[in-house]
């Protein structure tokens, strides 16, 4: 048994890395192997993550923390039985990738423009918590052409636009997703879509 | 210059309680209190994290000692609770710019433990 590709992993900068690698053959992940990690931290303790199947080859494992600081390292030993597969380390504030923005919402009722909101995925207290920016992505269920993404640069989870800049009478899709400057994350994942029907009263044409 | 200013250790019966700090001129990522016993190698006793969630503590005082820190002030502290004659030692604050806590020492406070 050998590792093919060796674990790579990514932070959400507060709870949960997520580390994958794919092994030489098919391979029950849960039952044949473990990933033990550990803090480089004196007095810390080793703690041993049971990965899941991500393939026939493809193993996946969701490493536990407490919270992150950017000076964390982590020794990971990839162990099947009693055989060392592979060592390595981790620097969680490396290799961030945000946490998904939750609860999507559009807000019609406000005379011809539509508001958008979301939430931050991260508490105050959170380094990541005012370093957010976001991309809204917004589409027609009808014209896959009418395709479009606003950068949110400021860091209030919201995005005004006129109603009237999307086609009328016909419904949308819109979703959204965050990434931080500071840390030069990858971008979150998609937060699930939300939808909704565009109508706006055209203004009476001056002859 | 950093400076790390420790107090709180005196003499205590058994089964007693003291609270020691340790005020650091600085934030460091690693805040940790060490002791050392006659005739015995320093030792770790218990350490913690910058942001003061994650704590960490030798086997021997497990659930009698409690680390905090107080980032603010850049104050570490340990509570002792329970205490028994083997953890009589001078008390050493360290604190470190990594995980190995040990980049700058305090002057160390005495702690008897005695009836």
């Known amino acids: 048994m050998k590792v093919l590709q060796e674990p790579t992993c990514v932070s959400d900068y507060m709870s949960i890395s997520t580390c994958e690698w794919k092994m030489n053959g098919p391979t029950n992940c849960s039952t044949e192997l473990r990933l033990l990690y550990q803090l480089v931290f004196l007095l810390s303790e080793a703690h041993t993550c049971i990965p899941e199947n991500n393939g026939g080859a493809g193993c996946v494992c969701h490493l536990l923390m407490d919270d992150v600081v950017s000076a964390d390292n982590y020794t990971l030993d990839l162990w099947a039985g009693q055989q060392l597969l592979w060592k390595g380390s981790f620097k969680p504030s490396e290799h961030v990738k945000p946490r998904a923005p939750g609860n999507l919402t559009v807000h019609t009722n406000v005379s011809d423009t539509l508001l958008l909101t979301w939430s931050n995925p991260y508490p105050p207290d959170n380094y990541l918590y005012n370093h957010l920016t976001y991309a809204v992505n917004i589409w027609s269920e009808n014209d896959p052409a009418d395709f479009r993404i606003y950068n949110v640069t400021y860091l209030e989870p919201s995005l005004r636009i006129a109603a009237s800049t999307l086609k009328s009478g016909i419904s949308y899709r819109a979703r959204v997703r965050a990434w931080a400057q500071c840390y030069n994350t990858t971008w979150s994942e998609w937060s699930p879509s939300t939808k909704w029907h565009n109508s706006y009263r055209e203004p009476f044409e001056q002859h | 210059q950093v400076q790390l200013v420790e107090s709180g250790g005196g003499l205590v019966q058994p089964g007693g309680s003291l609270r020691l700090s340790c005020a650091a001129s600085?934030?460091?990522?690693?805040m940790a209190w060490f002791r050392q016993a006659p005739g015995k190698e320093r030792e770790a006793v218990a350490t913690i994290r910058s942001g003061g969630r994650s704590t960490y503590y030798a086997d021997s005082v497990k659930g009698r000692f409690t680390i905090s820190r107080d980032n603010s002030k850049n104050t570490v502290y340990l509570q002792m609770n329970s205490l028994k004659a083997e953890d009589t030692a001078v008390y050493y604050c360290?604190?470190?710019?990594?995980?190995?806590?040990?980049?700058?020492w305090g002057q160390g406070t005495l702690v008897t433990v005695s009836s």
């Open positions: 600085g934030d460091f990522y690693c």
């Open positions: 360290a604190v470190g710019v990594d995980g190995n806590c040990r980049n700058y």
